[in-house]
């Protein structure tokens, strides 16, 4: 008996071939001997089966002795043994229809779980193997689960169902809703304007939801809500903004926030959350702000940084075009009685300068100038 695998919703063509290459009488029946379709001369006739409106044949092939049964919009319950009667002989074809569906929506939030469920006919014992867009293989029976979806899991998942040494392939498009970056860090000199951007890693026709930026300043005892906003069809409208700092927000995607000036009291880390309509859970992006200040008070030249710096970052003070006078893995460095000239304060990571602030030290009888 020939086995054919089909996919729910698809069309399958079961073949039946006569030895004579001409149009002769044939008919297809199911295992209950109920006629599905056949011919009367050059006319297609249909029987009282449940497939009535979904069954067809290919008249153009009858003259070549081919009498296929075409079943459209396959259902799991179409799984059966189909019999083709032609020239006093019977050809049996076993059709097994499978369906593979994602648990709920194919648009899932980062960190959520994806469950793929296999629908299969009674008596079958298929195995399933799925390959994610990033090449990860998962295997299972009736259900396959992937927890903690990541951004790289967005794309086409290819799943192969194996039964009786035959296989059928499903392709499911999964969209992982996330920000492009889980975390970002902005380095700024005191007084500079700060731009925070929160680009999304997906595109959808209509995007509606609401968001909030919570901020934990290094100097503050508590985290504060800095801004709340609504998103309607990709248009951003601010609901509430804190008095200090006076943040500004762009009206279009990507989500964009501007802090008029970087100040030590703002240095810290924030968490932007976005709740999307009809989705449980929220999207998160962490953002960090590091602020540098170089000052000269009397005979002391000081450079300080505030905010979340890694312990391996180096803070240095150097006179332009000279070796660093002081260099430490600390958040403040200073030079007593600095000589006149342009001093540079540098925050660097393995030699790469992340932030630089210049301060001009004048001869002792005058006051310093900050360029």
């Amino acid at each position: 008996k020939k086995v054919v695998l089909g996919k729910k919703g698809d069309t399958v063509e079961l073949t039946c071939t006569a030895s004579q290459k001409k149009s002769i009488q044939f008919h297809w029946k199911n295992s209950n001997q109920i006629k599905i379709l056949g011919n009367q001369g050059s006319f297609l006739t249909k029987g009282p089966s449940k497939l009535n409106d979904r069954a067809d044949s290919r008249r153009s092939l009858w003259d070549q002795g081919n009498f296929p049964l075409i079943i459209k919009n396959l259902k799991i319950e179409d799984s059966d043994t189909y019999i083709c009667e032609v020239e006093d002989q019977k050809e049996e074809v076993q059709l097994l229809v499978f369906g593979l569906t994602a648990n709920s929506d194919t648009h899932l939030l980062q960190g959520q779980s994806l469950t793929l469920t296999l629908e299969s006919p009674p008596g079958s014992s298929p195995s399933v193997q799925c390959r994610s867009p990033r090449g990860k293989n998962i295997q299972g029976g009736k259900t396959l689960s992937v927890s903690q979806l990541e951004l790289q899991d967005s794309g086409t998942w290819t799943c192969t169902v194996l039964q009786n040494q035959k296989k059928v392939e499903f392709k499911i498009d999964i969209v992982v809703l996330a920000f492009q970056k889980a975390s970002s860090i902005v380095y700024k000199k005191e007084g500079e304007q700060v731009e925070f951007s929160f680009p999304l890693a997906f595109t959808v026709e209509k995007l509606t939801g609401s968001g909030e930026l919570w901020w934990q300043a290094e100097r503050a005892s508590s985290s504060k809500s800095w801004i709340t906003f609504d998103l309607k069809n990709k248009e951003v409208s601010v609901k509430r903004v804190t008095q200090d700092p006076k943040l500004q927000m762009g009206k279009k995607l990507p989500l964009h926030l501007t802090l008029p000036q970087a100040l030590p009291q703002y240095a810290g880390s924030g968490n932007l959350t976005l709740a999307l309509e009809a989705k449980t859970g929220k999207l998160h992006q962490e953002v960090n702000l590091v602020v540098m200040r170089a000052t000269q008070l009397q005979k002391n030249l000081t450079c300080e940084v505030w905010g979340p710096t890694s312990p391996k970052l180096m803070l240095s003070l150097k006179l332009e075009n000279k070796e660093a006078k002081v260099s430490k893995r600390e958040k403040a460095v200073w030079v007593l009685n600095p000589e006149a000239g342009m001093w540079q304060c540098l925050l660097s990571d393995s030699g790469q300068v992340l932030l630089e602030s210049n301060i001009k030290v004048l001869p002792t009888w005058s006051t310093p100038v900050q360029p």
Epitope: W214, Q216, A220, S221, S222, S223, K224, S225, R240, T242, Q243, D244
Partner: antibody, heavy 119, light 107 residues
């Protein structure tokens, strides 16, 4: 909704110790610094102490420095005030308070617990 | 510690009166000041934050002004429920410090 409930007050002799608790609910305790403020009978408000959201920093009023210790257990959503070497002038209603989400004002207060230091 | 001097310590006024309470800081605290109302047997209630911003849910007859060292709380038209004690609190530095309070009584 935000709730702060103080407990542990009572009558204690001078020189003895007492521990107050403040149990929080209705908000993410781990994100907030919490203050203790006191008020002696018929007198004004006096700020006592604060502990940072993560317990990393603590500040005290000069009048209690070295005698009082603030602490927190974020897993229990509870704030503590350990009061040692108590004096008659420590007699007061003790409030725990939390800042607003949008500003530095003390927007949420407990109902207070009375501590009486008397022999 | 920063000293906060509040005046007057008490005042008598009638319903509909305009009432002004002042608070002076011993050093510059920018606009880091809040005003609180307290009724007998109750916890204080935040009225004004950052010197001049009305806390959500507080009637608009309350207003605050000032910056640096001198600050004012104004009640434009005193209502029966406004008879209470008012305190300023500096949140510029630790230790935080309150003013001594101003008791607003019915004339």
């Amino acid at each position: 909704q935000v709730q702060l409930v103080e407990s542990g007050g009572g009558v204690v002799q001078p020189g003895r110790s007492l521990r107050l608790s403040c149990t929080a609910s209705g908000f993410n305790f781990i994100n907030y610094g919490i203050h203790w403020v006191r008020q002696a009978p018929g007198k004004g408000l006096e700020w006592v102490t604060i502990i940072w959201y993560d317990g990393s920093k603590k500040y005290y009023a000069d009048s209690v420095k070295g005698r009082f210790a603030i602490s927190r257990d974020n897993s229990k959503n509870t704030l503590y005030l350990q009061m040692n070497s108590l004096r008659a002038e420590d007699t007061a209603v003790y409030y725990c308070a939390r800042e607003d989400d949008w500003n530095d004002g003390l927007a949420y207060w407990g109902q207070g617990t009375l501590v009486t230091v008397s022999s | 510690a920063i000293q906060m001097t509040q005046s007057p310590s008490s005042l008598s006024a009638s319903v509909g009166d305009r009432v002004t309470i002042t608070c002076r800081a011993s050093q510059d605290i920018r606009n880091d000041l809040g005003w609180y109302q307290q009724k007998p047997g109750k916890a204080p209630n935040l009225l004004i934050y950052a010197a001049s911003n009305l806390q959500s849910g507080v009637p608009s007859r309350f207003s605050g002004s000032g910056s640096g060292t001198d600050f004012t709380l104004t009640i434009s038209s005193l209502q029966p429920e406004d008879f209470a004690t008012y305190y300023c609190l500096q949140d510029s530095n630790y230790p935080r410090t309150f003013g001594q309070g101003t008791k607003v009584e019915i004339k």
